[in-house]
Amino acid sequence: TTELTEEKYEYKEGQTLEVKCDYALEKYANSRKAWQKMEGKMPKILAKTERPSENSHPVQVGRITLEDYPDHGLLQVRMTNLQVEDSGLYQCVIYQHPKESHVLFNPICLVVTKGSSGTPGSSENSTQNVYRTPSTTAKALGPRYTSPRTVTQAPPESTVVVSTPGSEINLTNVTDIIRVPVFN
């Protein structure tokens, strides 16, 4: 068994969380990915990518931006203008059905506190960035970054959790539930 330990990020209000979630590209390149918040036993999907996934085409839902790189098996998640009420446990999942999601990596424990971030809000709230072109054995990506499109989605959906924080799960193939931000 493997314990899905939490990785903690501490921020002040107004700052930005950015994480990268790896997935087995041969299995999930064309699947929808989602970012969910753990709320009891029924986590809520906050944002999900469209199908089929397009390389580096951001999907924005409110303050959350998802960028999928299916050629590399990488989902980047960005939450801007963090608020105290955003505190909690989050996970990247492969979204296959509202009642069936595959957790990609260990939960992120986000702790947001009040107080000055010491950083101008304008730079924190920006979602634009210039990313390097990857130098890798995998295929190179296409255009680096386009303006995020806002996607109107239904209210958050519930999914069955693969594992609750701190619990242990049996892994038949550890690449299905993955922690690393580099590509499998």
Epitope: K12, Q15, L171, V174, T175, R179, P181, F183
Partner: antibody, heavy 119, light 108 residues
Framework: EVQVLESGGGLVQPGESLRLSCTAS????????MSWVRQAPGKGLEWVST????????YYADSVKGRFTISRDNSKNTLDLQMNSLRAADTAVYYC????????????WGQGTLVTVSS | EIVMTQSPATLSVSPGERATLSCRAS??????LAWYQQKPGQAPRLLIY???TRATGIPDRFSGSGSGTEFTLTISSLQSEDFAVYYC??????????FGLGTQVEIK
């Protein structure tokens, strides 16, 4: 407790080869990317190479591309760095480092192994 | 390639005083920055990641701030064990992942 331990360093002549190894314990090895980072004597840190948890994707710094090969054996919890066509500029302490779970930083490091390339 | 510039190269501080180390990125890296401490003859140790979050076991006298291109590591009250070299590292997305040249914090 997470532990990584490097071995295989030594003195070689320019143009020769050397293979570094790293043994890891205390975490699910095949669920994390691993990297090599080096430090020339009296200098700063330089990222060298990274391999994904499954070993299917590798990355190299331009300075070693085509000469170094990173690989891993998940059944043995080992990471290797095959270094060919070594140059004096490759002289450094080579660290094996575990990549963190949600971003590309290094949360656990070995103590390093010294590679000296000199004629 | 993103260039990370650390300043000053050497910082002389008395024990108990505050130390402020700077790191500048050549382009925006949002909060994708880590700080490491390295003592002579030892491996680097992760201090801060995500620009602000202390790694497990790191005392709260260490704090990180900044975003975009300008970052700061502050040691509120220097202890004898804090005299070392400190490196910043960016991890915005694709390699190469680059380090700054380091700041040596020495006893004044």
């Amino acid at each position: 407790e997470v532990q990584v331990l490097e071995s295989g360093g030594g003195l070689v002549q320019p143009g020769e080869s050397l293979r570094l190894s790293c043994t890891a314990s205390g975490f699910t090895f095949n669920a994390y990317a691993m990297s090599w980072v080096r430090q020339a004597p009296g200098k700063g840190l330089e990222w060298v190479s990274t391999i994904s948890g499954s070993g299917s994707t590798t990355y190299y710094a331009d300075s070693v591309k085509g000469r170094f090969t990173i690989s891993r054996d998940n059944s043995k919890n080992t990471l290797d760095l095959q270094m060919n066509s070594l140059r004096a500029a490759d002289t450094a302490v080579y660290y094996c480092a575990k990549v963190a779970g949600s971003n590309f930083f290094f949360d656990h490091w070995g103590q390093g192994t010294l590679v000296t390339v000199s004629s | 390639e993103i260039v990370m510039t650390q300043s000053p190269a050497t910082l002389s501080v008395s024990p108990g005083e505050r130390a402020t180390l700077s790191c500048r990125a050549s382009q925006s890296i949002n909060s994708n920055l880590a700080w490491y401490q390295q003592k002579p003859g030892q491996a680097p140790r992760l201090l801060i990641y995500g620009a602000y979050t202390r790694a497990t076991g790191i005392p709260d006298r260490f704090s990180g701030s900044g975003s975009g291109t300008e970052f700061t590591l502050t040691i509120s009250s220097l202890q004898s064990e804090d005299f070392a070299v400190y490196y910043c590292q960016e991890f915005i997305m694709w390699p190469p992942w680059t380090f700054g040249l380091g700041t040596q914090v020495e006893i004044k």
